[in-house]
């Protein structure tokens, strides 16, 4: 059983989707091993909790590993009323949380 | 709280072995997950290799996991009685020179690490 770290990307919500008055913003966590990771969400430094959701891929046939998409979703008006989105992952494989951010307008 | 100490570090030749030592000292029961890490100087602390201390829902209790720079050369264990996991590296190479660090979690899904130790340090002459 090898361990891989996830490599983690976080993507935010595009304008077509702003558009229809709603934002998805992704967390997703590439090739890792094994399957238990965690991810947490932080608006303006804020914990979040119970707006998003979590999708895990089976197995890669190729490699064993995992990946995993993490979406938190919000109004295009509590998107728009904060600047910094955050989600820090925790992984067997990381000696310490992974976080990955962008500010709002900025991207 | 739990407490690591690891001890076994030192100087050795390329080619050569070394066991560390990890003793845990404190509410040892509540550990379900031991590692092993080195961070050499001027990078990212690598995890190298882990053991399952108490058996969950997903893993058995001896169940060992390896990150790509320890699998083959290094082996993990742990005396559940002595409270002390072990890592034992054999063909070291210069490029193994490091501090090594034990870390525990009590997370049955082990996903961060709870407590660390100070570090030994692993030194590998050509």
């Known amino acids: 059983r090898t361990v891989a770290a996830p490599s983690v990307f976080i993507f935010p919500p595009s304008d077509e989707q702003l558009k229809s008055g709603t934002a998805s913003v992704v967390c997703l966590l590439n090739n890792f091993y094994p399957r238990e990771a965690k991810v947490q969400w932080k608006v303006d430094n804020a914990l979040q909790s119970g707006n998003s959701q979590e999708s895990v891929t089976e197995q890669d046939s190729k490699d064993s590993t995992y990946s995993l998409s993490s979406t938190l979703t919000l109004s295009k008006a509590d998107y728009e009323k904060h600047k910094v989105y955050a989600c820090e992952v925790t992984h067997q494989g990381l000696s310490s949380p992974v976080t990955k951010s962008f500010n709002r307008g900025e991207c | 709280q739990v407490q690591l100490q690891e001890s076994g570090g030192g100087l050795v030749q390329a080619g050569g072995s070394l066991r560390l030592s990890c003793a845990a000292s404190?509410?040892?029961?509540?550990?379900?997950?031991m590692a092993w890490f080195r961070q050499a100087p001027g990078k990212e602390r690598e995890f190298l290799a882990s053991?399952?201390?108490?058996?969950?829902?997903?893993?058995?209790?001896?169940?060992?996991f390896y990150g790509d720079s320890a699998e083959g050369r290094f082996t993990i264990s742990n005396d559940n009685a002595r409270n002390t996991g072990y890592l034992q590296m054999n063909s070291l190479k210069p490029e193994d020179t490091a501090v090594y660090y034990c870390?525990?979690?009590?997370?049955?899904?082990?996903?961060?690490?709870?407590?660390w130790g100070q570090g030994t340090q692993v030194t590998v002459s050509s």
């Open positions: 870390a525990a979690t009590s997370l049955v899904n082990p996903t961060r690490y709870d407590y």
């Open positions: 404190g509410r040892t029961s509540s550990i379900h997950l």
């Open positions: 053991i399952i201390w108490t058996g969950g829902t997903t893993y058995y209790a001896g169940t060992t």
